[in-house]
Amino acid sequence: MSKGEELFTGVVPILVELDGDVNGHKFSVSGEGEGDATYGKLTLKFICTTGKLPVPWPTLVTTFSYGVQCFSRYPDHMKQHDFFKSAMPEGYVQERTIFFKDDGNYKTRAEVKFEGDTLVNRIELKGIDFKEDGNILGHKLEYNYNSHNVYIMADKQKNGIKVNFKIRHNIEDGSVQLADHYQQNTPIGDGPVLLPDNHYLSTQSALSKDPNEKRDHMVLLEFVTAAGITHGMDELYK
């Protein structure tokens, strides 16, 4: 077990803070909840503290919760491939470029680390080149979320990882908006981290609303499990 992994044996409170600017539309989001890495479970609620969110909530899910991949459930035989927990408590910097097909792009930079007993994800997001009447600024996405696989590989030069995946957002007219994600994570501290063999995270997300919440908000339930690395041969012959 890495030292960081010891911090995730129980339920951990999570705080998310985002400052965004998309085509000049500035906004802030605060989120709270908890994560349980034993089950790969996240429960979070987000509010836009600046009024109405200028982009659809589903376009921010990867920035919020795929940001705290340290809560992914890594099976016993894969624990030596869990970069995310091994970087804790000092944490990691997570940078992404998200290309929305036939539309604009988000660039995000986040610091994910422990502050006291709380896992904090502080994010800056800049979005450019979006069409004012497109699927994103035109709010044409359905309020739901598909399952995805998130592919992880080691980046030995930077002592971190590179991550690639393609999100499929459902559009109200029945079509799909693709969002190509290019991600890199580097540790904040200088302690040892686990550099993984290639594998993937399998994610399932459910979006809902709190009927008593007056502010523009999103409630998120997510399950994430690591997969893609088989047991060694010695395991097969036990």
Partner: nanobody
């Protein structure tokens, strides 16, 4: 656990002002006021984050009510101006362990017993 005690309620005439106060027995996260009219559900009125940089009001009181807090004294106050008959009811102080200001009553762990406001 944190105890909350409200004060300042009373009988006023429409158009008058009233200031409610809430004292907490210790530090808290976000704090809010909720209003419960006779036979109605408890509804969010206004709230404030621990730093005071995030304040939010229900549409029905915007421009009339003001909320502030004093972290040194663990108090939160609600200044109510231009009171209307529909403002009548019990006002509850509520607090969260954590910092984010939500408006849903289910997000608040600590509650006072309430103070009655009557508008004639």
């Amino acid at each position: 656990d944190v105890q909350l005690v409200e004060s300042g309620g009373g009988l006023v005439q429409a158009g008058d002002s009233l200031r409610l106060s809430c004292a907490a027995s210790g530090p808290t996260g976000a704090m809010a006021w909720f209003h419960q009219g006779l036979g109605k559900e408890r509804e969010f009125v206004g709230g404030i984050s621990p730093s005071g940089d995030n304040i939010y009001y229900a549409d029905s009181v915007k421009g009339r009510f003001t909320i502030d807090r004093d972290n040194a004294k663990n108090t939160v106050s609600l200044q109510m101006n231009s009171l209307k008959p529909e403002d009548m009811g019990v006002y509850y102080c509520a607090a969260r362990r954590r910092v984010t200001l939500f408006t849903s009553r289910t997000d608040y762990e600590f509650w006072g017993r309430g103070t009655q406001v009557t508008v004639s």
